[in-house]
């Protein structure tokens, strides 16, 4: 038998520095977790102790903190090179700055293979990107070879900016011929490494003949065997075992997100490359693991530019940006409108001639808006200002919901109106009218939504049975502020871009902003 140790990360999302337990900014260093310096310590410790070790990343290194905003992926290449990753799969967020924003900082600089079997380049891009990412790579490990085949969410065109010259094929259809090719090269130990979410990971394990292990990402899935060491609740055991259609037991793993854990999977293969056994658990990278001094010094060197950036002007406002709780928790506020407009603007994807855009709606809990911005400071808006408005380091995500769920969400928005509670919703692409004289749960008297399948956008009544795409904070997608119905009833959830980054990009693009209160949210009494 031959033993392989797979160390894996996914959805690190720009958490190069250590973070607090909830993956936001580190405040009390003695209680902080993750970060590349701490990750390196643990990886090196395992490399020294065990003979056959692979360090893999399942995508979405890009996007999530000011590190990505400033360095645009150069930081990913630099520190992944320093940690000596063996391979990475492309995630959807790797395309956030377009194909050029992937090629220049990452593909050209990585000292390790970057993989995806189901992304096919066409037109002029085909030769430009040729060889910069691969469908698979064969890596020697000890005296054996291991094949690693990559995959990426086929929803990427709706979630990021890959452009029109990349085709995202069905994962299973694209993977099978590449795995078959590896088999003809006498590679009998094959890992599928990719970024399509836990459900697709399990399908790949079930359907793709010849895949021995699946290492996934995208869904931020936490798997654990035994008592979990932190706040994350396991979605299943680690590894999660799938019985393939041809009767094999295929381990599937993922390691939550944000570099908080290092996935640790030990696989035992027989001489024919069959998996005999698999066991392990994610390792919580808490403060009991010291940060590597040389990586930490490098992080501190790179940090300097970030501090300078946060005080530079992004754009100007010529109006007061009312982000006060007195406004945003009680009525339509122009800060809420600004943020929602930025959220929609960030999700403009013209992927179908029938639709002016794939999504038109935004909801945002008023309690998530933490500060106003005064225009009487020469109108200047900085990253620092925005960090006061959106201090939680969240993301603006894409979900699919039925109209009935949205109706419940808007009822919840005002079910205890008047107590300055955070669940009051700010909106974009939605016109809502509340009648507070009615009993809680029956206060939404009008709910119109902006059409997407139209050349001239207009507002139509919400249909209860229709499925709608909505942009909202990850906090709401996860049921925060009591929006349990969103968490329980959402049909799809794809994590998006860092909240501050979305708003800062919009302000930089617009240069001068003047958001108004314009009747998106109204109150009435009497009949309708």
């Amino acid at each position: 038998a031959w033993e392989l140790t797979i160390l894996h990360t996914n959805d690190v999302h720009s958490r190069l520095e250590q973070t607090s337990e909830d993956s936001s900014k580190c405040v009390n260093a003695s209680r902080c977790m993750g970060g590349v310096a701490r990750l390196f310590t643990k990886v090196q410790q395992i490399r020294r102790a065990e003979p056959n070790v692979l360090l893999l990343d399942a995508g979405d290194q890009y996007q999530g903190t000011i590190w990505f905003t400033v360095y645009k992926g150069a930081e990913v290449a630099h520190f992944m090179n320093a940690l000596r990753y063996d391979a990475m799969a492309l995630g959807n967020h790797e395309f956030d700055n377009g194909v050029e924003g992937l090629i220049e900082p990452l593909l050209k600089e990585a000292k390790f293979p970057i993989l995806s079997a189901n992304i096919k380049a066409k037109g002029p891009l085909a030769s430009q990107i040729s060889g910069l990412y691969l469908p698979y790579k064969v890596l020697p490990v000890g005296d054996e070879v291991v094949g690693i085949v990559g995959y990426t969410s086929k929803e990427t065109p709706f979630l990021s900016n890959p452009g029109t010259n990349l085709v995202f094929e069905d994962e299973i259809t694209a993977l099978q011929p590449e795995v078959d090719k590896l088999k003809t090269l006498n590679v009998n130990k094959i890992i599928a490494l990719g970024h399509s979410g836990f459900e697709m990971d399990k399908l790949i394990a079930q359907k793709v003949r010849g895949v021995d292990v699946v290492v996934g990402g995208h869904s931020n899935t936490f798997l654990y065997t035994g008592n979990p060491p932190s706040k994350e609740v396991p979605a299943g055991k680690y590894p999660f075992i799938v019985t393939s259609d041809d009767g094999r037991k295929v381990p599937v793993v993922q390691a939550y997100a944000f570099g908080k854990y290092l996935g640790y999977l030990k696989i035992e293969f027989d001489e024919r490359g069959n998996v005999i056994s698999s066991h392990g658990n994610p390792i919580l990278l808490n403060s009991s693991i010291p940060e590597d001094p040389s990586i930490k010094a490098d992080i501190n060197k790179w940090r300097i530019k970030l501090d300078n950036y946060s005080t530079q002007e992004l754009g100007k406002t010529i109006v007061y940006l009312d982000g006060s709780s007195q406004s945003c928790r009680f009525r339509e506020c122009n800060m809420g409108n600004l943020i929602c407009d930025a959220m929609i603007n960030n999700n403009l994807r013209h992927t179908d001639e029938m639709f002016w855009n794939h999504v038109s709606m935004c909801i945002l809990n008023g309690g998530g808006i933490r500060s106003p911005i005064d225009e009487r400071n020469n109108g200047t808006i900085t990253w620092e200002n925005l960090a006061a408005v959106l201090p939680f380091g969240g993301t603006f995500d894409l979900v699919q919901l039925k109209g009935s769920t949205l109706k419940k969400a808007f009822e919840h928005s005002v079910h205890r109106y008047g107590q300055s509670t955070g669940e009051f919703l700010q909106v974009g692409g939605i016109h809502v009218v509340y009648d507070l004289s009615r009993k809680p749960g029956d206060r939404v008297v009008k709910l119109d939504v902006l059409c997407t399948k139209c050349r001239v956008p207009s507002y139509d009544p919400l249909k209860m049975d229709e499925v709608y795409k909505v942009i909202l904070p990850n906090f709401l997608a996860n049921g925060g502020d009591g929006f349990q119905m969103i968490k329980d009833e959402l049909l799809r959830h794809d994590s998006g871009d860092q909240d501050i980054n979305v708003v800062s990009t919009y302000i930089s693009k617009m240069k001068v902003i003047y958001p108004a209160v314009e009747g998106r949210i109204k109150f009435s009494t009497g009949s309708h």
């Epitope: 050209k108 990585a110 000292k111 390790f112 293979p113 030769s127 040729s130």
Partner: antibody, heavy 117, light 106 residues
């Protein structure tokens, strides 16, 4: 297929400059960095520097920083290495090589530069 | 600057012999090490990168291993066409070649 075709041999006087070219074909020139390496007669390989053709960014061996200049012409997919203030010890074969995964993969055929009075 | 010490500077072996060349870096180079073969009057040819990964089409008799500061290049069964000079290169911090090892057949 990937090819790097270099310019012909040069004979130069001490104190002069030489400009060696490397024309790339079979791939998109701007998608990969280009290295320059030299080899004096009977000696080992010595790295001079590298250039990112899409943005013109360069990294140099400290030894050559003041005398070597790396440039590109994107329209013709050609990389250039100019070495100034030549001395007899600069007599060498100069190679261009494409960078992949941080190292070299494809190499040019080499250009012999002879510095002699 | 990282220094690379390659040894031996030359060796003579018989066809079929196992040949080993070593490279020692002046500091940990994180396995960012390549091996090249250069035949007389020819350009170098890349054989191995990342200490142990073969370039496509390179015969399996060539292999690399090592980590940290110490690396080894092995020809498991020397062939007449393997007569050449072999170089290591570190690419962890910029680039430094080893001095080369000339391999001859007895």
């Amino acid at each position: 297929q990937v090819q790097l075709v270099q310019s012909g041999a040069e004979v130069k006087k001490p104190g002069a400059s030489v400009k060696v070219s490397c024309k790339a074909s079979g791939y998109t020139f701007t998608s990969y960095w280009m290295h320059w390496v030299r080899q004096a007669p009977g000696q080992g390989l010595e790295w001079i520097g590298e250039i990112n053709p899409s943005i013109g960014r360069t990294n140099y061996n400290e030894k050559f920083k003041s005398r070597a200049t790396l440039t590109v012409d994107k329209s013709t997919s050609t990389a250039y290495m100019e070495l100034s203030s030549l001395r007899s010890e600069d007599t060498a074969v100069y190679y261009c090589a494409r960078r992949v995964y941080g190292t070299m993969d494809y190499w040019g055929q080499g250009t012999l530069v002879t510095v002699s009075s | 600057d990282i220094q690379m010490t390659q040894s031996p500077s030359s060796l003579s072996a018989s066809v079929g012999d196992r040949v080993t060349i070593t490279c020692k870096a002046s500091q940990d180079i994180n396995s960012y090490l390549s091996w090249f073969q250069q035949k007389p009057g020819k350009s170098p040819k890349t054989l191995i990168y990342r200490a142990n990964i073969w370039v496509d089409g390179v015969p399996s008799r060539f292999s690399g291993s090592g980590s940290g500061q110490d690396y080894t290049f092995t020809i498991s069964s020397l062939q007449p066409e393997d007569i050449a000079t072999y170089y290591c290169l570190q690419y962890d911090e910029l680039y430094t070649f080893g001095q080369g090892t000339k391999v001859e057949i007895k």
